[in-house]
Structure formats: C-alpha cells, structure tokens
Amino acid sequence: YDFTNCDFEKIKAAYLSTISKDLITYMSGTKSTEFNNTVSCSNRPHCLTEIQSLTFNPTAGCASLAKEMFAMKTKAALAIWCPGYSETQINATQAMKKARKSKVTTNKCLEQVSQLQGLWRRFNRPLLKQQGSSDYKDDDDKHHHHHH
C-alpha cells in the first residue's frame, strides 16, 4: 500500500490521543533504554510503511501484535485516514486470523513495540522543509503545511 495520500495530521492526532497510551501500557515495566532502536524511517509515508510492517507482520520471536489494542487502533486509523487502505488489508486480515491463536508478550515483542514507539515518534515530528528554506527535501507533506 502506498501511504502517500493519507491524512497524516489526522493519523497523528489518533496516535497522540489513544494509540500512544496503549503502547505505553504494553511497555509498562520496561526501561526506555532497554532496547536499541534499529528501525528508522525517512518520511511520513515511509514511517507508516514501517509501522504497518512491524505492527501486523509476524516476525521471528513475536508471532503477531495484531490483536493488541494499539494494533487495532492503528488499523482503524489507517482505514479511516488512508484512502483505499481497507481494501488492501482484507486478505492480510484473514491470514492473520488463521495464524493467531493467543496473545503472548515475549521479550522480542517488547523490543518490537519499542521500535514502533520510535517510528511513531519520527512520524509525528518530522523536520519538515519550511517555506523559503532549502535545508533538505521532504515531499511527503505537500498537502500538510504545518510542521507538527
């Protein structure tokens, strides 16, 4: 899915209002310095691509996070604010239902959610090009003029 046409500010609002709190709840009892962030993203569509991958794709040691509260809210936000996103996810969702039986929090899952927090942080706070500035290029916010 190409996240270029999502309403980034609405997704950001959904994250700050609810998703971030669910991530904090999931990570409760874990020190913020316990994991090194190794996953990064360069712009908002790329961040959403990485967020989707880490949230919904099974990885070694962390079968799936898809039934966690933060994941369900992430899916809802993407479905609402990314045109056509829902249609692309029907097959993926069915596959996930078959693969996922129970929720188990492993250390690998905690590490993965720590990575997610870093990706969301980057998504929320890109250093966007200012008017009249040529510091660097960032094309993903062509219809969102606010820096934050």
Epitope: E9, L16, S40, S42, R121, R125, H147
Partner: antibody
Framework: EVQLVQSGAEVKKPGSSVKVSCKAS????????MHWVRQAPGQGLEWMGA????????SYNQKFKDRVTLTVDKSTSTAYMELSSLRSEDTAVYYC?????????????WGQGTTVTVSS | DIVMTQSPDSLAVSLGERATINCRAS??????????MHWYQQKPGQPPKLLIY???NLGSGVPDRFSGSGSGTDFTLTISSLQAEDVAVYYC?????????FGQGTKLEIK
C-alpha cells in the same frame, strides 16, 4: 539516567564563531529530534533550530539560517551548534534540548546551558 | 511566524492563592482537534522544565495544582494554590508551525 551535558562557557570576539557541544546519554540518540534554544541575559527563550540525528535532517529558524549550523556525531551521541559572525547580541545561554518520548513535541530533557559571551 | 503574547508580564500572588497566566497566539495552534501548546517553568540559573503539554496535559512529576486550558489562540496556565517553590518565570510555547516560538515570559512572585 537520561541526560544532556554541554560544553563549558566561551568568550568570543565579534566576527568569530563558536561551537557548542551537547553529549547525550541514557537514550537512543539517533531517534530523537534535538533542538537548540538560546536565552539572552534577562530575556526570554528563542528557538534556533533542530536536527534529527538519524539522518542529519535539520530545520532552522530563518532568523539564524545563514549563521547557524547544526550537526551530530552519532558515534559519540553528541550534537553540535556552531554560530558564526558573532555579535554582541549573541551573548546568551545556549541550551540543547531533546524532544519527548512520544512525539508530543515538548522538550523533556535539557542540557545545563552554555554561556557564550561576545565581547571585544 | 506565530507570535505568542503572555499576560501579565509579571504577577504577584499571595501564598495559597490562585495564579493565572494567559497566552495568546497570533494564529491558531490547533491541528486536527489538538492544541500544540506547551507551558514551561524556569527558575534562576536552571533550564526550563515542562509543566503542561498539549494545552491541558500535566507533565510527568508536576504537582496537580498546575493546570492548563484553552484552544485555538487563547490559553491559560493556572496554579490553584501558590507555593513558595512556584516562584519562577513561566513560558508558553507553540510547536504547530515552524519556527517554534515562545511567549516573552511571565515572572511570578509572592505578594
């Protein structure tokens, strides 16, 4: 412990440059926006710019755009602010600050400040 | 640039009394239903410390006598019962639009 430790006070001549360092510890430096804020004696806070250590992207206050350069050294988790063509009005305390964990955009960790005095 | 104007410039309040500081932005700092306005406290010789984020959310470890309200262009920081340790300069900050800007500060003293 999450902290930012800045370099010591500097006295500079007008027209020269100053480079202030800010060493981070206790967090993954490369994934947080790092900001620079200055405060002239008895005055308020003024945002100078920010840098994302992950890829070196910067955003500057246009007021300082031609004179300030923000850089990072990821290997030492250190952010740098260089201000050139100094004038007496640049006499101030310069702070580095980290954005919060959650992308709210507030500055939750600050350096202790570096006093820069510009005098002939 | 968004100009942040605080009022009053200085304020003297008796211990135990309510203190109110206002901040007005030259344009809205709201985006998608959220207000991107923060409040900081600064004591002499120290860096600023976050009090309130996003207009009304209490910062970590901040006493609940502090509260924030407002949206759009008008915001208020309230200290319900002034304590001696609250003597400081208070700043509002908007982060909705570059450049990030602060209010000029309000100096709070004990009457």
């Amino acid at each position: 412990e999450v902290q930012l430790v800045q370099s010591g006070a500097e006295v500079k001549k007008p027209g020269s440059s100053v480079k202030v360092s800010c060493k981070a510890s206790g967090f993954t430096f490369s994934t947080y926006n790092m900001h620079w804020v200055r405060q002239a004696p008895g005055q308020g806070l003024e945002w100078m710019g920010a840098i994302y250590p992950g890829n070196g992207e910067t955003s500057y206050n246009q007021k300082f755009k031609d004179r300030v350069t923000l850089t990072v050294d990821k290997s030492t988790s250190t952010a740098y602010m260089e201000l050139s063509s100094l004038r007496s009005e640049d006499t101030a305390v310069y702070y580095c600050a980290r954005e919060d964990d959650y992308g709210e955009g507030y500055f939750d960790v600050w350096g202790q400040g570096t006093t820069v005095t510009v005098s002939s | 640039d968004i100009v942040m104007t605080q009022s009053p410039d200085s304020l003297a309040v008796s211990l135990g009394e309510r203190a109110t500081i206002n901040c007005r932005a030259s344009e809205s700092v709201d985006n998608s239903g959220l207000s991107f306005m923060h409040w900081y406290q600064q004591k002499p010789g120290q860096p600023p410390k976050l009090l309130i984020y996003r207009a009304s959310n209490l910062g970590s470890g901040v006493p609940d006598r502090f509260s924030g309200s407002g949206s759009g262009t008008d915001f208020t920081l309230t200290i319900s019962s002034l304590q001696a340790e609250d003597v400081a300069v208070y700043y509002c900050q908007q982060i909705n639009t570059d450049p990030l800007t602060f209010g000029q500060g309000t100096k709070l003293e004990i009457k």
